[in-house]
């Protein structure tokens, strides 16, 4: 069972003193963020118990296996049902504190009961209040049953429940009809899933036998010991004032473990601590009485004496629990009360004896679950005593359960039981994620779910060259970090496979699942510079570059061109596709905007060194376009061109760029700049005859604006072949821009 | 299904007596008070007598206490009511029903009926 | 024992009217007051418990209301499938007792 412990606090004469403390004795327990244990939950169950709403609790965590809640301002907040949840996976356990109000109406006489399935369970309520109303049993919060206030039996109101099932488990309380439901006696029922002496799927194993006041659990056969006792089957006492599975916990105060609640895994439920009982576990045992809630008789014989936390303290040469054994009966000494072996493992166990007769090696035997009995392959005699040792054949997993040392000789006999948990090795259920990738190493997570049984103690990362048939390489990891694996061949698939392990000899699990990973290529190692560049309009930039001349092939897939625009704070990314190119065209750029550009090499997802970067302005945009262009024939080799000046202008405009081309031609237009922007007509000459041209221009201030519409014109007659158009403004001759 | 089934009605002479089952299915029985209320012909309700889910306590209406006995066989899941000295005015369709509780509101209800069963006291 | 009074003891309405019943205890019974509806041939069946809880399935139209010796049962729009008798039960002490009802036929 998991060793998780909660405490209450029942000094309740001030409710702001009052306080619920849950101890968790697991390894790790706790640690919240760490894969390997969820933290430990302490809260008030209000979904049965429903109180008024007052402050929230304060909760704080002592450490990482203790959490304490307080804030409790008024008796009703302590009222209800409280529970603590710890231990991790499939060992998660919740442990439940049901709080009575001591002023209620109706008080439980003993609030958990825990009884076997088929038994009769007998809830019984006392009147401390009395109401000469109904008194209303609920189960779980709903209606259960009903009896007269007549019904009292010695001031009692009794709830029998016959042949109990586990669904019949929960919170049961009485009520009387009309009264606050914070006077009611709340019980906590909990009906082990076998009959009394039984455990497992089918109840079909028998319980080792607790001592003490321990409850098997009917779902692995353990005893739960009461707080103060430990050992497998609760055979041994702790000191006074210590609690937890190997009486590691201390009570706190100085009054020891007086006016605490201890609640642990059910089917054990909640008692006073050892040496304790009463309503608020403020009495001391009476005489001859001790144990959890004082429910146990000493008895003891041959001049023992009953202490109140442990039990008969015997005289020199008598031992047993009533002091019953004679010293010269053999008995078994200092056997561990739980062995943990790994499946498959062959074990050496040793059982020491003592006694008169001296026991020898034929008198010690080893019983296993099924009843096979193991005789000793050798023994160690000295003075007092003999340690008999047995090898144990390869365990299956039906080997875990009580196993048994067995000595006997003539003044006697003597057993003590011992659990047995064979665990299964780790294996691990999927392969190792893969986190990042260089040319020469890969970073692998080697955290992955796992059958079998934990802890993990070690995690290897087997890794080699995909279909190759040399040695695996391996690499010894902690479970919990991230692993380089270094030194490997660039652009190469590599298996990789990772085997768990789990503490003790044959804890090596079988090797998970492989899964493939490849190394990035070679990282390009040339630099590029850059030649030149020139704008070609406000958005656009050519730009080119070289690469240093080496020998061999090319270690590149292509380019990537990096604008920064440090204003804006953006950065233009362009792909060169091709390792042959060495000039780029740079569109949808920012008119107005200082970049800085630089281009460096790619080859797979790896980046080269970059080039020196260049800094380039781009001009600004430019004005609109100018409205109503209009064009007239005027012979067989002139047009005449008409505008308005653009609306709006940000500035004075430099000049007028004319565009000319023929119309379905296919050669590049003709660029003509109108040097005098003042003038809203121009002349084009020296165009062919006959011929049908498109027309379209743009104003200039810094940067060259947006274009006008185009306008369709044919020039004239037959006449001969010009030269080319050239542009007269008012009979000044302007040279052709191309 | 949850339901209440009333019998052993029928017609009695004056001073005679008769026994009234009430058979219930669908629901733990032996948790529940139970009651019988009568109503005779063109009249209102009268509730008659209760008894508490145990057996162990009874209640009855002063014009039957004394001639009337209602009782309980949690483990046939049937409730009776035992009439003697049978008089005119006991004829009535006699209900049994189950009195409930909420279990936020904490008031008694009747919340299930059986459909009845007639006694007619005649000479 | 505890005397209940329904009035009046019987009305008439038409669908979509809304109607109320009324019903006066002889001594202080708090909320513990109940309503059963029924009709000839039938059973009661629970309407309204404690006051002013709707069982389970009954149409909202149905409510209660009141305290202490003075309650009211309203139908806030008469349907044709609601006319019937209306009776009263306190559950505030034994014996339970009834009111003589209230017939609601139609107009």
């Known amino acids: 069972a998991v060793d998780l412990t909660l405490l209450a606090n029942l000094r309740l004469t001030d409710p702001q003193r009052f306080f619920l403390t849950c101890v968790s004795g697991e390894a790790g327990a706790g640690r919240g963020s760490d894969a390997w244990g969820p933290p430990l939950l302490l809260e008030k169950d209000d979904r049965i118990v429903r109180t008024p709403p007052g402050p929230p609790l304060r909760l704080a965590r002592n450490g990482s296996h203790q959490v304490t809640l307080r804030g409790f301002s008024k008796p009703s907040d302590l009222v209800g049902v409280f529970s603590c949840v710890g231990g991790a996976g499939a060992r998660r356990t919740r442990v439940i504190y049901v709080h009575n109000s001591p002023g209620a109406h109706l008080l439980p006489d003993k609030v958990t009961h825990t009884v076997n399935k088929g038994d009769t369970a007998v809830l019984s309520a006392r009147v401390h209040k009395e109401k000469q109303t109904d008194v209303i049993w609920k189960s779980n919060g709903s209606y259960f049953y009903t009896l007269d206030w007549h019904e009292a039996q010695d001031g009692r109101f009794l709830l029998q429940l016959p042949n109990v099932q586990p669904p019949s488990s929960g919170i049961y309380s009485a009520t009387y009809l009309e009264a606050s439901p914070l006077g009611s006696a709340f019980f906590r029922l909990i009906v082990r899933g076998c009959g009394a002496g039984r455990w497992g799927p089918g109840c079909t194993k028998e319980c080792p036998g607790c001592l003490h006041g321990g409850v098997c659990h009917d779902h692995d056969g353990e005893c739960v010991c009461p707080p103060g006792f430990t050992g497998t089957r609760c055979e041994q006492a702790c000191r006074e004032g210590r609690f937890g599975q190997s009486c590691q916990e201390q009570c706190p105060g100085i009054s020891g473990c007086r006016g605490l609640t201890f609640c642990l895994p059910d089917p054990y439920g909640c008692s006073c601590g050892s040496g304790w009982r009463g309503s608020q576990c403020q009495e001391a045992c009476a005489p001859g009485h001790f144990g959890a809630d004082c429910r146990l008789q000493c008895q003891c014989q041959n001049g023992g004496t009953c202490d109140r936390f442990s039990g008969c303290v015997c005289p020199s040469g008598w031992h047993g629990v009533h002091c019953e054994k004679s010293d010269r009966i053999p008995q078994i000494l200092n056997m561990a009360s739980e062995l943990e072996f790994n499946l498959e493992t062959m074990p050496r166990i040793n059982c020491a004896a003592a006694g008169n007769p001296f026991p020898v090696r034929g008198s010690i035997e080893l019983r296993k679950p099924d009843g096979t009995v193991l005789l000793s392959t050798k023994a160690i005699v000295e003075p007092e005593k003999t340690t008999a040792e047995f090898e144990v054949p390869r365990l299956v997993l039906a080997d875990s359960g009580f196993w048994e040392c067995r000595v006997s000789t003539s003044g006697g006999q003597d057993s003590r039981r011992f659990k047995v948990n064979v665990k299964v090795p780790p294996v691990p259920l999927a392969a190792p994620r893969l986190l990042t990738k260089q040319s020469r190493q890969l970073v692998v997570s080697p955290l992955v779910s796992f059958s079998g049984d934990g802890p993990i103690s070690t995690v290897r990362l087997h890794y080699r060259p995909q279909d190759s048939t040399m040695d695996w390489s391996t690499i010894v990891v902690d479970p919990s970090e991230n692993v380089t694996l270094m030194n490997l061949r660039p652009k190469t698939g590599y298996s990789v496979r990772v085997q768990l392990s789990r503490p003790g000899e044959g804890g090596e699990g079988a090797w998970g699942p492989p899964t493939l990973m490849t190394t990035d290529c070679p990282e390009p190692l040339l630099q590029p510079w850059l030649e030149g560049w020139h704008v070609e309009g406000t958005d656009r930039l050519r730009v080119s570059w070289s690469l240093p001349l080496v020998p061999g092939p090319l270690v590149g897939d292509g380019f990537l061109l990096r604008l920064w625009d440090g204003t804006r704070g953006q950065e233009r990314r362009e792909n060169v596709s091709s390792p042959q190119a060495r000039t780029a065209l740079l569109t949808g750029l920012t008119p107005g905007t200082h970049y800085q550009l630089d281009v460096q090499l790619y080859h797979c997802t790896l980046l080269g060194p970059a080039s020196p970067p260049a800094h380039v302005l781009l001009p600004p945009s430019g004005p609109p376009a100018p409205r109503h262009l209009h064009a007239q024939a005027l012979s067989d080799s002139e047009i005449q061109l008409t505008w308005k000046h653009p609306e709006a202008l940000p500035g004075p405009i430099s000049k007028y760029v004319v565009e000319v081309q023929v119309a379905g031609g296919a050669g590049d237009p003709l660029w003509i700049d109108v040097d005098r922007p003042e003038e809203t007509s121009t002349i084009i000459r020296g165009l062919n005859a006959s011929t049908r041209y498109l027309f379209r221009m743009r104003a200039s201030i810094q940067g060259l604006g947006d274009w006008s519409n185009t306008v369709e014109e044919s020039t004239l007659g037959n006449g001969l072949q010009a030269e080319g158009p050239v542009q007269e403004s008012r009979a000044a001759e302007e040279g052709l821009d191309q | 299904e949850v339901q209440l089934l009333e019998s052993g009605g029928g017609l009695v002479q004056p001073g005679g007596s008769l026994r009234l089952s009430c058979a219930a299915s669908?629901?733990?029985?032996?948790?529940?008070?139970m009651v019988w209320v009568r109503q005779a012909p063109g009249k209102g309700l009268e509730w008659v007598s209760v008894?508490?889910?145990?057996?162990?306590?009874?209640r009855y209406a002063d014009s039957v206490k004394g001639r009337f006995t209602i009782s309980r066989d949690n483990s046939k899941n049937t409730l009776y009511l035992q009439m003697n000295s049978l008089r005119a005015e006991d004829t009535a369709v006699y209900y049994c029903?189950?009195?409930?509780?909420?279990?936020?509101?904490?008031?008694?209800?009747?919340?299930?009926w059986g459909r009845g069963t007639l006694v007619t006291v005649s000479s | 024992d505890i005397q209940m009074t329904q009035s009046p003891s019987s009305l008439s309405a038409s669908v979509g009217d809304r109607v109320t019943i009324t019903c006066r205890a002889s001594?202080?019974?708090?909320?513990?007051l109940n309503w059963y509806q029924q009709k000839p041939g039938r059973a009661p069946s629970l309407l309204i418990y404690t006051q002013s809880n709707l069982r389970s399935g009954v149409p909202s139209r149905f409510s209660g209301s009141g305290y202490g010796t003075d309650f009211t049962l309203t139908i806030s729009g008469l349907q044709p499938e609601d006319f019937a008798t209306y009776y009263c039960q306190q559950s505030h002490s034994a014996p339970r007792t009834f009111g003589q009802g209230t017939r609601v036929e139609i107009k």
């Open positions: 008894i508490y889910p145990s057996g162990g306590w009874t």
């Open positions: 669908g629901f733990t029985f032996s948790h529940y008070k």
């Open positions: 029903a189950r009195e409930m509780i909420d279990t936020i509101s904490p008031g008694w209800h009747f919340d299930l």
């Open positions: 001594q202080n019974i708090n909320i513990y």
